[in-house]
């Protein structure tokens, strides 16, 4: 009997959890040669993104490993972790504990005017508590940074403050006005919960929101500082103290990045200049008649900062404003977040190193980590290979893009530290978990802001990652030439080590080709290749955007594909590449295996699985993403890839198999 | 203190310009958005026009009755604000006060005004 | 355009009294309302913003209200020193409109 000869399907626990999932997400009475969006992700318009559900399952995971009743080492990372959690968790001793934990928080920074009592006190010294005992920035953002000439150097920046409230330079006047009230609503909320007289509460919430409003004003747009090479302008302490004199730049900065030793000769990166001159302005003005307001913003400012470690009076006075101010963005309504995923984001944000450990343990053991490297290097072989066949590359360039994927690093689903238990077990001596949640926030926030920066402080780091393990999204630091694939991506169902190959190439697979791709973006800039056949690149380019251009768009949808040329090409490319990998996989290694009931072959299940990572709902944001929307990302690649048609015996001219073919990569 | 002082007024015929001009001290001056608001005799005030900051690409909005006719400029290093009205008409008349935005909206500060008189 | 109607542009009241000038927008403005004062031969003076904000030295027996389309402006007890026009302004949307103006006089 021929058929015995054919793929086996997979009856194991993980593969028939999949087969349920492509089941339940997707639409088999759709042509898939017309629609494959549809046939993959039909179900699942309506649902969240494939990587948000992947996000929340990572999180009901760590969930899980810190519900579990543990004896851990006293005083250790661990305990720490789980200590903190049940705390935040601890609502009852919240609600108890009321506004008194941020009365004293407020009493310490010299009280305000809005509850009575106030010491008018040092302008700088509060600012000062702030940026360093806080972590709060009312008026710019310090942070530590790669040096723009030389990214393994940490430089400290200056960049404009972030605002708490989604303000847009080209607003126009009424939805400005109308998130200005909204926002003076939350203040006063704020203020009346915190005992003020309602009175001076608006009067002080008012002014607040007129400080928001100047700052707001003063910045720069990027492209504007860009344009005229204000974006990173090297400036000494000194030389920003003449600049900006309201502020007190050498102690704040100093008491902010303990332990490092500042001078006032120490070099900064600024990154608007003239913000912070007319920033200092407006303090200095403020400062001369109305010192109290000025307390009062940069307080009010905090308690907003803090509010997510408040009562529920807090939490939901925070609710109803943002969901005011999604309704007036015209966003759609936030779901509401349960209090536990609330929780074990803060808990992974303030005992990382911890937490990390934990759950590569858990969800990225040995074989998991061995099969996903396995995975990559087969993409890697795929992409090397592909590079010596492309005919906008001479030979000098192929060499050159050779030498720069096998010099690249990977880091598969966790950063070194993490692999490492005894590097990872720390000891967070210096937090204290206080009597009430918020003074145990505000300790962690402490702890935190030094580990930062003595991680900076460290000879030759190795590459710092900018997700966590957990996280769902890879990228490839070009100052590292070090490609990261997070643990929380490398899970079911994009990929398992049980699963059929099919699935691991064409959803893992594709994502690790994708990624690998942005090592050469900047050869697909204008300008960006010299040596290559620009003329054939040239043609490679604009047929791809005339390939993408031709989609119908699905209503209310938009996007804007200068913004996404880049990522289109990656997304073709790496399907392709995936799919060259996985053939040459086939050709070397038998027993491959499907999913039962589905009636789809390995290939088909390639597709499949590529198209599925892909799920999601289109949302207005869609205009401003570098992707294109869903269905463009799953349909530009596939119906730029011949064997799709093949295989799923699509006629000439369907939409899915056009005439013409655009090749890139 | 805040001080705002207008000049420029005066008898124009019809069809003629005129460019008013408003001296500010007492402030930083580039730091507020500034305005023209006007006040026909006898009547109520009118806004007329609205002058962002460099940082907002010294962006301006103006009543729909001056749009064309007036123009609302800056120049930061004078701490000044102008208004150049052309083909003027009798109902252009009135005190033409300049004013400061305290912050994206009240006029908190106000000169003492100046007349414009359209009249053949 | 939005229309701030000040239906009374006249209103009598005496020293000590209590008065309110009403002021109705032909939209919804969003408490983005303010109140000036202008005395006889001056030039007008900020009272009131976000509808009941008192601005900086603006003695507390002014007080503003309301929301939505309708807004007031009450002074709790007339002192001789408030005989003046007063106008109600939106700036919640270009152009930036006035009311008519209410005529305060003492009797």
């Known amino acids: 009997n021929f058929q015995n000869c054919g793929p086996r399907p997979c009856e194991t626990s993980v593969c028939l959890d999949l087969r349920d999932h492509y089941l339940a997400s997707g639409n088999t009475s759709v042509a898939p040669c017309t629609d494959f969006f549809s046939f993959a992700c039909g179900r699942a318009k309506e649902t969240n993104n494939s990587f948000q559900e992947l996000a929340t399952k990572n999180k009901n995971r760590l969930r899980r490993i810190l519900e579990v009743q543990n004896s851990w080492h006293p005083g250790s990372g661990e305990e720490k972790a789980f200590q903190f959690y049940n705390s935040c968790m601890d609502t009852l001793a919240i609600e108890a504990a009321g506004t008194g934990p941020l009365r004293q928080v407020i009493e310490e920074l010299g009280g305000w005017r809005i509850s009575g009592k106030w010491t008018s006190l040092n302008f700088n010294r509060t600012l000062r508590l702030l940026m360093s005992q806080y972590g709060h920035f009312p008026f710019f953002r310090a942070y530590l940074g790669p040096h723009p000439a030389s990214p393994h150097t940490p430089v400290i920046q200056i960049d404009q403050p972030e605002f708490d409230v989604p303000l847009k330079q080209d607003q126009e006047q009424k939805i400005y006005a109308q998130i200005f009230r909204e926002y003076l609503t939350y203040l006063n909320q704020l203020g009346t919960l915190l005992g003020g007289d309602p009175s001076k509460v608006q009067e002080h919430s008012s002014l607040s929101i007129s400080i928001t409003s100047r700052l707001f004003q003063f910045l720069r747009p990027l492209e504007q500082r860009r344009a005229q090479g204000k974006l990173f302008q090297m400036v000494t302490i000194d030389q920003l103290k003449e600049m900006a004199p309201a502020i007190d730049w050498l102690s704040c900065l100093q008491a902010t990045f303990t332990p490092m030793s500042l001078s006032p000769s120490q070099s900064l990166v600024v990154h608007d200049v003239e913000y912070l001159k007319n920033m200092s302005q407006l303090v200095e003005e403020m400062l001369l008649k109305q010192r109290d307001f000025l307390q009062s913003h940069m307080i009010l400012g905090l308690v907003v900062t803090l509010s997510p470690a408040l009562d529920s009076q807090f939490q939901e006075a925070r609710r109803k404003l943002s969901q005011k101010l999604r309704e007036l963005t015209e966003q759609p309504p936030m779901p509401a977040r349960p209090r536990w995923m609330k929780c074990v984001e803060e808990t992974g944000t303030f005992f990382e190193p911890t937490l990390a450990a934990l759950f590569v343990r858990e969800a990225f053991g040995p074989s998991t980590r061995s099969a996903a490297m396995k995975l990559f290097t087969a993409i890697r072989d795929a992409l090397i290979t592909r590079l010596r066949n492309l005919p906008w590359m001479n030979e000098e360039t192929q060499n050159m893009a050779q030498d720069k994927v096998a010099q690249l690093q990977v880091e598969m689903g966790a950063s070194e530290w993490a692999l490492k238990p005894e590097l990872a077990r720390q000891e967070y001596n210096d937090i204290q978990l206080g009597s009430s949640f918020l003074q145990s926030v505000l300790s962690c926030v402490r702890s935190l802001r030094a580990r930062i920066v003595q991680s900076f402080l460290q000879p030759h780091p190795q590459h710092r990652w900018k997700v966590s393990p957990w996280d769902v999204n890879a990228y490839y630091s070009v100052s590292d030439h070090v490609v990261v694939f997070p643990a929380g991506l490398l899970q079911p169902p994009f990929f398992h080590p049980g699963y059929p190959r099919a699935v691991n190439f064409g959803a893992a697979g594709s994502i690790m080709a994708h990624e690998l791709l942005h090592i050469f973006y900047q050869l697909l800039l204008p300008g960006g290749c010299l040596a290559c056949d620009n003329h054939a690149l040239q043609e490679a380019h604009l047929c791809l955007k005339r390939h993408y251009a031709a989609f119908p768009l699905p209503s209310r949808t938009s996007f804007n594909d200068s913004l996404t040329f880049l990522e289109n090409a990656a997304d073709v490319g790496g399907l392709a590449i995936a799919l060259q990998a996985y053939s040459k996989r086939l050709l070397r290694h038998h027993g491959e295996t499907v999913l039962p009931s589905l009636d789809l072959s390995p290939q088909q299940i390639f597709f499949r699985s590529y198209a599925q990572v892909m799920c999601r709902k289109p949302s207005p944001q869609d205009s401003h993403d570098t992707h294109s929307p869903p269905h463009l990302r799953v349909h530009g690649p596939l119906s730029s890839t011949p064997a799709f048609a093949r295989y799923f015996r699509c006629a000439r001219g369907a939409l899915l198999n056009p005439s013409s073919r655009c090749q890139l990569w | 203190e805040v001080k705002l002082e207008e000049s420029g007024g005066g008898l124009v015929q019809p069809g003629g310009s005129m460019k008013l001009s408003c001296v500010a001290s007492g402030f930083t001056f580039s730091n507020y958005w500034m305005n023209w608001v006007r006040q026909p005799p006898e009547k109520g005030l009118e806004w007329v026009a609205e002058i962002r900051l460099n940082s907002n690409n010294y962006a301006t909005h103006y009543a729909e009755s001056v749009k064309g006719k007036f123009t609302i400029s800056r120049d930061d290093s004078k701490s000044s604000v102008y208004l150049q009205m052309n083909d003027l008409r009798a109902e252009d008349t009135g005190i033409y006060y300049c004013t400061r935005n305290w912050d994206f909206a009240w006029f908190d500060s106000w000169g003492q005004g100046t007349l414009v008189t359209v009249s053949a | 355009d939005i229309v701030m109607t000040q239906s009374h542009k006249f209103m009598s009241t005496s020293v000590g009294d209590r008065v309110s000038i009403t002021c109705k927008a032909s939209?919804?403005?969003?408490?983005?309302v303010a109140w000036y004062q202008q005395k006889p031969g001056q030039s007008p003076k900020l009272l009131i913003y976000?509808?009941?904000t008192r601005h900086t030295g603006v003695p507390d027996r002014f007080t503003g209200s309301g929301s939505g389309t309708d807004y007031t402006l009450t002074i709790s007890s007339v002192q001789a020193e408030d005989l003046a026009l007063y106008y109600c302004?939106?700036?919640?949307?270009?152009?930036?409109?006035f009311g008519s103006g209410t005529k305060l006089e003492i009797k």
């Open positions: 939209q919804d403005v969003s408490t983005v």
């Open positions: 302004q939106q700036h919640y949307t270009t152009p930036f409109t």
């Open positions: 976000w509808a009941s």
